[in-house]
Each structure stands twice: as C-alpha cells, then as structure tokens.
C-alpha cells in the first residue's frame, strides 16, 4: 500500500481467483484513543472499533472510503483504491490502446516546435467517476522540471455503439534548450482513477521524435503565362521554431482530386514555393516536416486549383 | 575551414555535407523510430556519446558570438562517431548488409571532420568508451542505438551549418 495523495491510498493486488489479497492497517488521524468506530462509504454498519482497523483487501467491495468516528463526529477518512496486477501485468482497463505507432500505446504526445512545450492525449470509453493527474520530468534518475496543466476533456466521438472521450494535457519544460541535442528523454506519468480502480500509464520520448509542425500557412497560387503550370507559395507556420535559417523545414507539394486514387502531381522542396500542374476540380496541398530529422509530417494545408 | 585559431569554416560545403549525413543516417537505419530502444537500458550504452548541449554555443546566438566552441564540439562528435562506425560494433558479426549505407556514412563523417579541422591543427577529441558487446544480438542493439543517437547529433550539426551558411558566410 502507498499514498497517492493525502488520505488516498493505493492497494496493489495480485488479481486471480481465490487470491489472498492484502492485509491493510488503517490508523485514525486523531489524538483520541478510545470510543472510535469505523464505517465504509455510506453504510452505517460498524466494521470495527479502536484507533486502528485491520482489513483484508481482496476485491473492489473492500475498497472505498473508510471513516473513523467518535460520538457521531467524523474524525478522519482514508480512501482505498485498488491497482490490479494480472499475470504480472498491471491492468490497463481505463484507457484505450491507440495502437499507433505500436501496440500498447495509451498516451500519445506531439510538439509543434522545439520550445519544450508538448501536448499528450489519451482515449477512454468511460464517461463518469473519472479523474486524471499528470506529472512529467526530463530524465528519471536526476529529473529536471516539466510543468503540466490539468487534464481536460478535449473531444467526444461516436465509434459504432460506443462513445469515445479524448482527454489532453499541455506540458512545458521549465528550462528548455531548443537548439541542444536531447540526451535524456521526457517522462510523462498519468494517474487514472475510475471509481475505486487506480491505474498508471507512462510514456517516454525525446521532443525531436514527437515533433509535428503545424501546416504551412498562407498558400497562394499564381498561374504561369502560356502554361498549365501554377506557382504555389506558402509560409512557415507561426508556431514553428525560429530562426527558420536554423530550424528549417522541408515540404511536400501535391495536386490531387477528391479521391486518393486519382492521379496526382507531387514534388518535394526545401523552398517556400514550387511549380506544379493544376487540374480542374483538384486541390493543391502542402505539408511540412523537419528538414534534418525525420519526425512526423504536418497535416496538409490546401487550396482549390480553380 | 574552421581552424582552432578561429577562422571561418566553409559554411556552404559543411552545410551540404551535413545534410548528406542526415540523409545517410536515416537511410542507414530508417525503421529505428519503430523500435523503442529506451526500453533496453539506454543509460549505460549510449550515455558516453558526445551530445551537443545547451552550453556548447550551437544555438543561433552562440554561433553569432563565437562559432568556435560549437564547431569544436561538432568536430569531437564527428570523430567519435567516425571511430564508432569503424569499430567492431559495426565490423563484427552479424555482418552488415552489403547495401548498408554505413560505409558511406563513415566516409562522410570523416569528410566533414576534415573540412572542420585541416591537418596540422588539433582539437582535443573525446575518448571512445570501451563498448565491446559479446553477443551478436547485443551488437545489433548497440548499432541501432548508436545510429539513433547519430541521427540526433547530425540533425543539430546540419542546423548549425545551414544557419551559418545563411547568416555567417562571408
């Protein structure tokens, strides 16, 4: 058993049929010595008396808010949560496996630039009695500070018969050094509590590996005289690191119709303009990627050909 | 050429060669991003590699003030990786695929380090740690880690030279 926060404790249980469970001793936070009784949750049934209560925690029915009283007055609470371990593996029931970029990916994180600011998000089908708390650091043995905000519900989607909820959190490295080569990864830890179930999820990454620039901005077209060709120009996204002579992007320019199966014109360039062939009912799209490190491409920025 | 005395390097040549290094480093191990190598206890194996750190003057302001600190750091790293790529970690079993770009990568690291430091000038270089994995699978894992680390190192070096070519070239 360990303390998650004040008056909230996590009991780690090996979860299998007829498991013996864990013996837990609760102590009432009071100077009083006698006349103390214990109850669980809303029940008035007295579980025991005395300053300490010893319980065998085997299942969720044994978890909950234990309260010690004296003469009708509440003295203190202890909330017990369960953390299940099945076949040596901690349970991951609360969050959905996003399976990208690999199986058992519960947390996904992205950064728009090298400033040390990043966003992580996760998915669940649970809608109520759910809380998250996020901590982060650079490195684990001698951790350097990363400050994370509160996790918030950022999207709701319908997936078949189920509703899916997306939560996200923004974090900022306290002393970021955008130009340096990272040697220690960022660690992100998410504590998830659903009713009386506790789970924790972690992710470890370098900012450089989670970079995904915003799409290029201000796409403009200029038809070339006596030609099917069009000059398309754009600008670096506002959110990208500066100066651009140092933090350079490379671009992919594509002309395609509505369907992915349609024929296309495609060209890669390090410049902020390119000449392509425009077709009726097609769109010109441009996306960006770090020029020197193969992290994710941005989403496409598009303008119609006509 | 960047000599220890403080003259300017051939920024544009360095830019071209460092960009080539980036391409080669990714083609040497393109799928490395799909392996979570940190799960394999990174600390003891690749913590010894030289990293371009915050105080090394490789940021735009540091380059403007005095690019020599940064260039020396890059030079150290290039020599370090060049030696690693020529060591038994890469030459031993399992043999590299014949079409592996590691050979080209090795030559390009040497080429860029020579551009930065002509013969007759000597910046101190970092000792190569004795990384001699006994098992072929350990060697394979170490190669992945070294290449992964090299990708990050050459990305910073390429940014430095691109910025230098754009803003510091005579």
């Amino acid at each position: 058993i360990w303390e998650l926060k004040k008056d909230v404790y996590v009991v780690e249980l090996d979860w299998y049929p007829d498991a013996p469970g864990e013996m837990v001793v609760l102590t009432c936070d009071t100077p009083e010595e006698d006349g103390i009784t214990w109850t669980l949750d809303q029940s008035s049934e007295v579980l025991g008396s005395g300053k300490t209560l010893t319980i065998q925690v085997k299942e969720f029915g044994d978890a909950g808010q234990y309260t010690c009283h004296k003469g009708g007055e509440v003295l203190s609470h202890s909330l017990l949560l369960l953390h299940k371990k099945e076949d040596g593996i901690w349970s991951t029931d609360i969050l959905k496996d996003q399976k990208e970029p690999k199986n058992k990916t519960f947390l996904r994180c992205e950064a728009k630039n090298y400033s040390g600011r990043f966003t992580c998000w996760w998915l669940t089908t649970i809608s109520t009695d759910l809380t998250f708390s996020v901590k982060s650091s650079r490195g684990s043995s001698d951790p350097q500070g990363v400050t994370c905000g509160a996790a918030t519900l950022s999207a709701e989607r319908v997936r078949g018969d189920n509703k899916e909820y997306e939560y996200s959190v923004e974090c900022q490295e306290d002393s970021a050094c955008p130009a340096a080569e990272e040697s220690l990864p960022i660690e992100v830890m998410v504590d998830a509590v659903h009713k009386l179930k506790y789970e924790n999820y972690t992710s470890s990454f370098f900012i450089r590996d989670i970079i995904k620039p915003d799409p290029p901005k201000n796409l403009q077209l200029k038809p070339l005289k006596n030609s099917r060709q069009v000059e398309v120009s754009w600008e670096y996204p506002d959110t990208w690191s500066t100066p651009h002579s140092y933090f350079s992007l490379t671009f992919c320019v594509q002309v395609q119709g509505k369907s992915k199966r349609e024929k296309k014109d495609r060209v890669f360039t390090d410049k902020t303009s390119a000449t392509v062939i425009c077709r009726k009912n097609a769109s010109i799209s441009v996306r960006a990627q770090d020029r020197y490190y193969s992290s994710s491409w941005s989403e496409w920025a598009s303008v119609p050909c006509s | 050429r960047a000599v220890p005395g403080g003259s300017s390097p051939a920024w544009t040549q360095c830019q071209q060669l460092s960009q080539k290094l980036c391409t080669l480093a990714w083609s040497a191990h393109p799928l490395v991003g799909h392996m979570d190598l940190r799960e394999e206890g990174d600390e003891e194996t690749t913590n010894d590699v030289p990293h371009i750190q915050c105080g090394d003057g490789c940021d735009p302001q540091g380059l403007r003030d005095n690019s020599q600190f940064c260039l020396q750091r890059i030079h150290q790293g290039l020599i370090f990786y060049e030696k690693l790529l020529g060591s038994d970690i890469f030459t031993g079993e399992p043999s590299l695929l014949p079409d592996s770009p590691v050979g080209q990568l090795h030559a390009s690291l040497l080429g860029l380090s020579q551009l930065l430091q002509p013969e007759g000038h000597h910046w101190e270089t970092q000792q190569i740690p004795s990384l001699s994995p006994s098992q072929p699978w350990q060697r394979l894992l170490l190669r992945f880690k070294i290449l992964r680390s090299l990708q990050a190192f050459v990305a910073v070096a390429a940014r430095v030279f691109a910025h230098g070519a754009a803003t510091l070239s005579p």
Partner: antibody, heavy 118, light 107 residues
Framework: QVQLVQSGAEVKKPGASVKVSCKAS????????LHWVRQAPGRGLEWMGW????????EHAPKFQGRVTMTTDTSTSTAYMELRSLRSDDTAVYYC???????????WGQGTMVTVSS | EIVMTQSPATLSVSPGERATLSCRAS??????LHWYQQKPGQAPRLLIY???QSTSGIPARFSGSGSGTEFTLTISSLQSEDFAVYYC?????????FGGGTKVEIK
C-alpha cells in the same frame, strides 16, 4: 495488369511527319497521365512531354515546342504522338508511358522505332 | 533546364559484388530523383522513386539514397540479370531530364 502497346516501326524522309500510337489496357484510361520519351540509338533517354487524357492538357519539353502534338482518343484508350518536320537526328525509339504520378514513369510501352533517312 | 550527370559511364563489377552508381544534379532537387534500369532491346523499368522509395516487385538488393544534388543507387550483390544500363531522372522541374546513364557490365 496495366499494359501499353505501341504501333510498329516507321521509316520516314526528312521533313515528313510521323504519328505513333499507344493503346492502353488494364486500367481506366483517364486515370493515368501519359508521357512520351525517346531514345536515339546508343544514346540516353529524352523526355518529350505529357498529356492528361481526362482533359487533353499537355506540356512539352521546350525542344519540341511547335513540332510535336500529343492527343488521345478516350473511346479507344489510345494516345498519339505526332512529330513534324522530321530530321535525321529524330531517329530514335519512341516510348509511351503511363503513371498516376505526373513526374516519373512507371509503365512503359515496348517502344516504336522511327528511322528518318533520305 | 536541370542537367543530370551520372558517373561512372561504365562500371565493371563481378557477380556477387556491390555496385554504387552516382547521379549529380546541376542544382538542388530535394528528393525529386528516380532510377530506371534498361536492358538491351527492352524498355526502361522503374526501380526507385523519390530517391529512396522502392517500387513493388523490385528486389531488395536495389536501394537509393541522397538528397539535394548528390544521389546514389546501390546494388548490394550483383546478379547476372542486373547487368544493364541505369538512368536517373529528376522531377524537380519541367522539362524532366535524365542522366546519361551508367552501364554496369560484367568484370
């Protein structure tokens, strides 16, 4: 599978014109760009231009501007390349090729030898 | 127009050996570079597109790398059917242009 079959060899006199055909099969004709590339004997490859069978748009290499016409007949899934004012240095194998991507050449015809000789 | 230069013009290699073919562009073309193989009396065949992407059905011994102005086609272990002429082609801008070719012959 995608296939391009070209017309047979031609012998022409200088100053004459030649029209080479290229019949496509195995795909929807308007879904691919069609290019023409030629290769003089013992020499390298030279791009001549492309046509979009969907709308008849064309783009030619400046070298052939005014001397080449590329057309398509969607009813027969056939592309044509006509080269006028032939000279001896137009002697070459002429290839048509098709791709969904505009700028490189995935599927090639077998080639048509055009000999220009007096 | 962009001029593509291939080297060497002829490469003599023994079967089983590695062949490295070079292609240089007269200006930076990013990764807009494609490789073709042509055997005598046949049409060319696409091997690699956008510098390093392998065409389906092409043996894994063919690989491409490079960006900017310098590109390489590597054949890791030459088989008898690989002796042919290899062309690079840029697609950075029109007119599309080819290199002069490298003939890979049996040593």
């Amino acid at each position: 599978q995608v296939q391009l079959v070209q017309s047979g060899a031609e012998v022409k006199k200088p100053g004459a014109s030649v029209k080479v055909s290229c019949k496509a099969s195995g795909y929807t004709f308007t879904d691919y760009y069609l290019h023409w590339v030629r290769q003089a004997p013992g020499r390298g490859l030279e791009w001549m231009g492309w046509i979009d069978p969907e709308n008849g748009d064309t783009e030619h290499a400046p070298k052939f501007q005014g001397r080449v016409t590329m057309t398509t007949d969607t009813s027969t899934s056939t592309a044509y390349m006509e080269l006028r004012s032939l000279r001896s240095d137009d002697t070459a194998v002429y290839y048509c090729n098709a791709n969904k991507e505009l700028r490189y050449f995935d599927v090639w015809g077998q080639g048509t030898m055009v000999t220009v000789s007096s | 127009e962009i001029v593509m230069t291939q080297s060497p013009a002829t490469l003599s290699v023994s079967p089983g050996e590695r062949a490295t073919l070079s292609c240089r562009a007269s200006q930076s073309i990013s990764i807009n570079l494609h490789w073709y193989q042509q055997k005598p009396g046949q049409a060319p065949r696409l091997l690699i597109y956008f510098a390093s992407q392998s065409t389906s059905g092409i043996p894994a011994r063919f690989s491409g790398s490079g960006s900017g102005t310098e590109f390489t086609l590597t054949i890791s272990s030459l088989q008898s059917e690989d002796f042919a002429v290899y062309y690079c082609q840029q697609s950075n801008s029109f007119p599309l242009t080819f290199g002069g070719g490298t003939k890979v012959e049996i040593k």
